[in-house]
Interface confidence: low
């Protein structure tokens, strides 16, 4: 139909720091090049309906939906969103096109939905449909990076199949141990997918996107280092690629390296070698063993041998599914009020876990440290001596693990009391859990030494919020004690606390704290 106007629908994505957004709802400043939304004529619809490509927006992002109309004469318009009409002010750009804009500031769930734009020009009427939804980050993934050899080159490619596309970086370090921590000056980062310098001491590849950051270390056996007391172990899942690097330095080039799996030489195509001279003219050789997709029969002892160094091995274990191995029995601890103490969980897991420590419905960050024996450890020290239940939770792609801890703080009881018309109750959270005595104060017993044993009921209850035990004792009021002062005392191995209560007729009860 030649009468139909030429329509262009665009999206303008405003960066968060864009101060120009929303200054004029009809003509916001453009902070980024507009993205074409297509605006195709919708077939089989009554009337002329154009449909723009669906727009998915981050929570709190700001966007402008804009329509450019190439049609002669004036236009009038109306926006409709969720059955409400919204003001529409068209204007003309330098090419004399009609421009209609809808600014959405700081996207929220309530702003998601269908935006209908009705346009009336001198020639015809038509409708434009925009669908705006909040971007669903649940569709996102962040997968641990893995390595591939670059075709026809001695270089490694780092790949992470993640959504959205991650930023990949190599993290390189040439010193040993602690100095290779992430923020150390010895660490060099290269934001690229391909790495040619493969002689470094410690090589990791990391991928990051909106979900966080995941890293994979290039497993290395260094023949110049003293072997670990326990054999290094590498876990992989069926189908994952295997990469082990063997590295050796010698005074000259007169040495060679070989890989064996269970005393059989690796097949050609499953290894490649590189060598270079270091600054002090010694020779560095590295020999990579790799399998592009491991199967169960790739399990075994991989041994790197040298004609000039003692050989070293690593145990490669191929598993069908990931796992988390740790003892899940709950553990109870009893510490003094100022004693230094940390909870700790020792575990073996593959792939690497994500974990949290939780206390009283509040989660705390979880750090994990690799041990030499293939195990990892996570410690939690930030309990601030608060008694109760602490939970360690870990998960990876295939497994979940939860472990409960109870922390008891040894301390003298503290007593709180309350009373009603028929009974008086005392509460204490000291530890060990206290025992109770009730005493009556009278003319005969001004020091409150007359013990009450009738009508006393003791119990312990778990205060659910913190998971800590509270002991209570209740005295049912009888005629014999009405109008008297009574004293409840809680005692344990660390001391005694008491509270005195006046048991008068019904009504508010004053409490007299006993020092």
């Amino acid at each position: 139909n030649q009468d139909l106007p030429v329509i262009k629908c665009v999206l303008i994505n405003h960066k968060n720091n864009d101060s120009s957004v929303g200054k004029s709802s009809s003509y916001p400043m453009v902070s980024e090049s507009p993205e074409d939304l297509g605006c195709a004529l919708r077939p089989q619809s009554s009337g002329t309906v154009y449909e723009a490509a669906a727009v998915e927006v981050d929570v709190s992002a700001s966007i402008t939906l804009q329509v450019l109309v190439d049609a002669p004469g004036n236009i009038s318009c109306l926006w409709v969103f969720k059955h409400s009409s919204l003001n529409c002010q068209p204007h003309f750009d330098l090419q004399n096109r009609g421009v209609v804009s809808m600014v959405i500031l700081k996207m929220t769930e309530t702003q998601a939905g269908e935006y209908l734009l009705f346009i009336q020009s001198e020639a015809t009427n038509y409708t434009i449909l925009f669908t705006v939804s909040i971007r669903n980050t649940l569709l996102y993934t962040l997968r641990r990076p893995y390595f591939r050899k670059m075709e026809n080159q001695d270089a490694l490619v780092c790949i992470s199949e993640s959504v959205p596309e991650p930023i990949v970086e190599w993290v390189l370090c040439d010193s040993q141990g602690e100095s290779c921590k992430e923020e150390s000056p010895a660490v060099v980062k290269k934001e690229e997918k391909v790495l040619h310098e493969l002689f470094g001491t410690d090589i990791r590849c990391c991928a990051r996107n909106e979900l966080g950051r995941e890293c994979t270390r290039l497993f290395t056996i260094d023949l110049n280092q003293t072997p670990q007391t326990t054999l290094p172990q590498l876990f992989l899942k069926v189908g994952e690629p295997l990469w082990i690097r063997c590295k050796a330095v010698h005074v000259n080039h007169g040495f060679g390296l070989t890989w064996e799996l269970e005393n059989k030489a690796l097949e050609e195509g499953n290894y490649f070698e590189m060598s270079t001279y270091s600054t002090n003219r010694t020779m560095i050789r590295i020999l990579f063993a790799f399998v592009s997709s491991v199967a169960r029969n790739d399990t075994g002892y991989y041994t790197c041998s040298s004609s000039k160094h003692p050989s070293q091995s690593a145990l490669v274990t191929i598993v069908e599914k990931g796992f988390i191995n740790a003892t899940n029995s709950s553990e109870d601890y009893e510490i003094d009020q100022y004693e230094e103490f940390c909870f700790s969980v020792r575990f073996k897991a593959y792939p690497q876990i994500r974990c949290t420590w939780t206390f009283s419905r509040k989660s705390f960050p979880c750090e994990q440290k690799g041990l030499d024996n293939g195990y990892s450890i996570s410690k939690f020290c930030n309990h601030k001596h608060q008694p109760g239940e602490y939970i360690f939770h870990a998960e990876n792609d295939d497994a979940q693990f939860t472990k409960m801890f109870t922390l008891n703080i040894r301390r003298k009881p503290q007593v709180l009391a309350e009373a009603s018309a028929s009974q008086a109750s005392c509460f204490s959270d000291g530890y060990p859990l206290p025992s109770w005595t009730w005493k009556k104060c009278s003319d005969k017993s001004p020091n409150c030494t007359e013990e009450i044993t009738e009508g006393v009921w003791n119990r312990k209850a778990n205060r659910k919020v913190f998971g800590q035990w509270v002991s209570s004792s209740t005295l049912n009021m009888s005629e014999a004690i009405k109008g008297f002062l009574v004293k409840c005392c809680a005692y344990n191995s660390l001391g005694t606390s008491c509270e005195t209560i006046l048991l008068n007729s019904p009504g508010p009860f004053p409490f007299i704290q006993d020092n």
Epitope: D58, I63, R135, N136, L139, V163
Partner: nanobody
Framework: EVQLLESGGGLVQPGGSLTLSCAAS????????MGWFRQAPGKEREFVAA????????YYADSVKGRFTISRDNSKNTLYLQMNSLRAEDTAVYYC??????????????????WGQGTLVTVSS
Amino acid sequence: EVQLLESGGGLVQPGGSLTLSCAASERTFSSYTMGWFRQAPGKEREFVAAMSWSGGSTYYADSVKGRFTISRDNSKNTLYLQMNSLRAEDTAVYYCAAGGSTRVVVTTTPVVKYWGQGTLVTVSS
């Protein structure tokens, strides 16, 4: 890796009904946009219907609107396609698909990450 297994295909007369099911292997099923595509002999694979991860949004090809209904049960990791008033032109291999947008701001079509093997639906008298 999500494995998708379709079932429920078969021979049905024009005007008849059929329900296809798609069982997903992964417990993260509920985080994927799920959909149905079909491929008739000698034709390209075409979109039939899709449903957002929460079930809050559904999308249909014009050719099946009003006749087909997509639904999902996240607790059973299963996607369904209820097909009523079937026509001869609905004959095709029906594929279950899982995926989601990789775009940061604009999504024109979901990027399908995983496909099922397909189940054949034949509408014939």
